[in-house]
């Protein structure tokens, strides 16, 4: 990890494993103010290899909504519409943190978690030619 | 929100914004045990929109390291290695929540943050504007 | 119920030519692909060629390319095979087989299959 | 082409026992990879699809599992209706290949 100085302005950890739980602020700052969201929001459909959002919802977790891609076709899509047999629909997969309630159903107490997601498909082929 | 049923067991708030501000646990609980991180490693230079990842770094955000996808071509690549303008390659983005340390360089103290990633490119149909 | 009957089979010499179909019933044909799959006597599976639910793609293995044509009928659910320069090796049962989506990756439902002997 | 080595070509196994059949690809294929049945004088019946998905009315005692260039197909308790010839086939680059079959016999 990095060294971070401390500065004496920072609220005081009781916690004898400190800095293993910390105090967040779940106002949460919105950095992407200057981005308009909607302009990706019509690539899934016009797409090379084209997907569905599906919504995946949990309750116990912090991000509650989180919406996964699902290829819809094996193959990519041609100019024509149809599939091009020679290459693939592959997800594009990230992993993001998300705060997981810990104990169960506790509004306050939360355990940060790893997931992986599908976030959109892209369009690959299948061999790759290794050049002797 | 979803109103989630108080457990006798959660510790206590003492934070009269209560829920804004919630203790986190950092030990991260990883649910992608069963995915190989190494098979989607490739689709960057396989994929007809291929694309570069580039490292951003800040120590005061956690996870402190995050890539970023930059689109290779402004168009898509063709089966005989050529790139085709008729169709364009675009990032695909993600809002993710990251952890932003508040105040500055406090171990122990974060506020969450989102933020817009590329996480990798798909290749799309232009959109044609047909002029009456 | 799904049905899928193949039909057109038989004796043929080398160099000959036969139209195998394969008439589906029971499901919605032109919404799923479909494919023509063959096993030699005795031996193993081997794709002979796929078509997507409405017959713009298509694909052949080197094995049958330029001598073999899969097409479809959608409006009378019916899978065809053109096989023409018919070799001894081509001696097979011909499968019609049907892809669960739309362009025929692999397979939920098998005909009986049709027996081809080429032979002189 | 991707080559679909299947093992082994053939064996026997009593009743209630577990079966374990391997298929290994010439490349990484993805979890593309099917699983099927063929009953002498029958035509192929489709098990396992994406390397472990169970086909609907398929019984729980058929499994799949798997990654990159190797898989396995597994019958938990092998029943005497289980006798038939199994085989994988990757649908992951064109063109679509098979293994050369599992031969499964009672003892």
């Known amino acids: 990890g990095i060294a971070i100085p401390r500065n004496s302005g920072c609220p005081n950890s009781e916690d004898k494993n400190f800095p293993r739980t910390v105090m967040v602020n779940l106002n949460i700052h919105n950095r992407n103010t200057s981005t308009n969201p909607k302009r990706s929001s019509d690539y899934y459909n016009r797409s090379t290899s084209p997907w569905n959002l599906h919504r995946n919802e949990d309750p116990e977790r912090y991000p509650s909504v989180i919406w996964e891609a699902k290829c819809r076709h094996l193959g990519c899509v041609k100019a024509d519409g149809n599939v091009d047999y020679h290459m693939n629909s592959v997800p594009i997969q990230q992993e993001i943190l998300v705060l997981r309630r810990e104990p169960r159903h506790c509004p306050n107490s939360f355990r940060l978690e790893k997931i992986l997601v599908s976030v959109g498909c892209t369009c690959v082929t299948p061999i790759v030619h290794h050049v002797a | 929100g979803i109103a989630i049923p108080r457990n006798s067991g959660c510790p206590n708030s003492e934070d009269k914004n209560f829920p804004r501000t919630v203790m986190v646990n950092l030990n991260i609980h990883n649910r992608n045990t069963s995915t190989n991180p190494k098979r989607s490693s490739d689709y960057y230079n396989r994929s007809t929109s291929p694309w570069n990842l580039h490292r951003n770094e800040d120590p005061e955000r956690y996870p402190s390291v995050i890539w970023e996808a930059k689109c290779r071509h402004l168009g898509c690549v063709k089966a005989d290695g050529n790139v085709d303008y008729h169709m364009n390659s675009v990032p695909i983005q993600q809002e993710i929540l990251v952890l932003r340390r508040e105040p500055r360089h406090c171990p122990n103290s974060f506020r969450l943050e989102k933020i817009l990633v590329s996480v990798g490119c798909t290749c799309v149909t232009p959109i044609v504007h047909h002029v009456a | 119920e799904v049905q899928l009957v193949e039909s057109g089979g038989g004796l043929v010499q080398p160099g000959g030519s036969l139209r195998l179909s394969c008439a589906a019933s029971?499901?919605?044909?032109?919404?799923?692909?479909m494919s023509w799959v063959r096993q030699a006597p005795g031996k193993g599976l081997e794709l002979v060629s796929i078509?997507?639910?409405?017959?713009?793609?298509?694909f052949y293995p080197d094995s049958v390319k330029g001598r073999f044509t899969i097409s479809r009928d959608n409006s009378k659910n019916t899978l065809y095979l053109q096989m023409n320069s018919l070799r001894a090796e081509d001696t097979a049962v011909y499968y019609c087989?049907?892809?669960?989506?739309?362009?025929?990756?692999?397979?939920?439902?098998w005909g009986q299959g049709t027996l081809v002997t080429v032979s002189s | 082409d991707i080559q679909m080595t299947q093992s082994p070509s053939s064996l026997s196994a009593s009743v209630g026992d577990r079966v374990t059949i391997t298929c290994q690809a010439s490349?990484?294929?993805?979890?593309?990879l099917a699983w099927y049945q063929q009953k002498p004088g029958k035509a192929p019946k489709l098990l396992i699809s994406?390397?472990?998905s169970l086909e609907t009315g398929v019984p729980s005692r058929f499994s799949g599992s798997g990654s990159g260039t190797d898989y396995t197909f597994t019958i938990s308790s092998l029943q005497p209706e289980d006798i038939a010839t199994y085989y994988c086939?990757?649908?992951?680059?064109?063109?679509?290949?098979f293994g050369g079959g599992t031969k499964v016999e009672i003892k």
């Open positions: 490349e990484d294929i993805y979890d593309r």
């Open positions: 994406g390397a472990t």
């Open positions: 029971g499901f919605t044909f032109s919404t799923y692909g």
């Open positions: 086939q990757q649908y992951w680059s064109v063109p679509w290949t």
């Open positions: 087989a049907r892809d669960p989506r739309h362009d025929g990756y692999f397979f939920d439902y």
């Open positions: 078509i997507n639910h409405n017959g713009g793609s298509t």
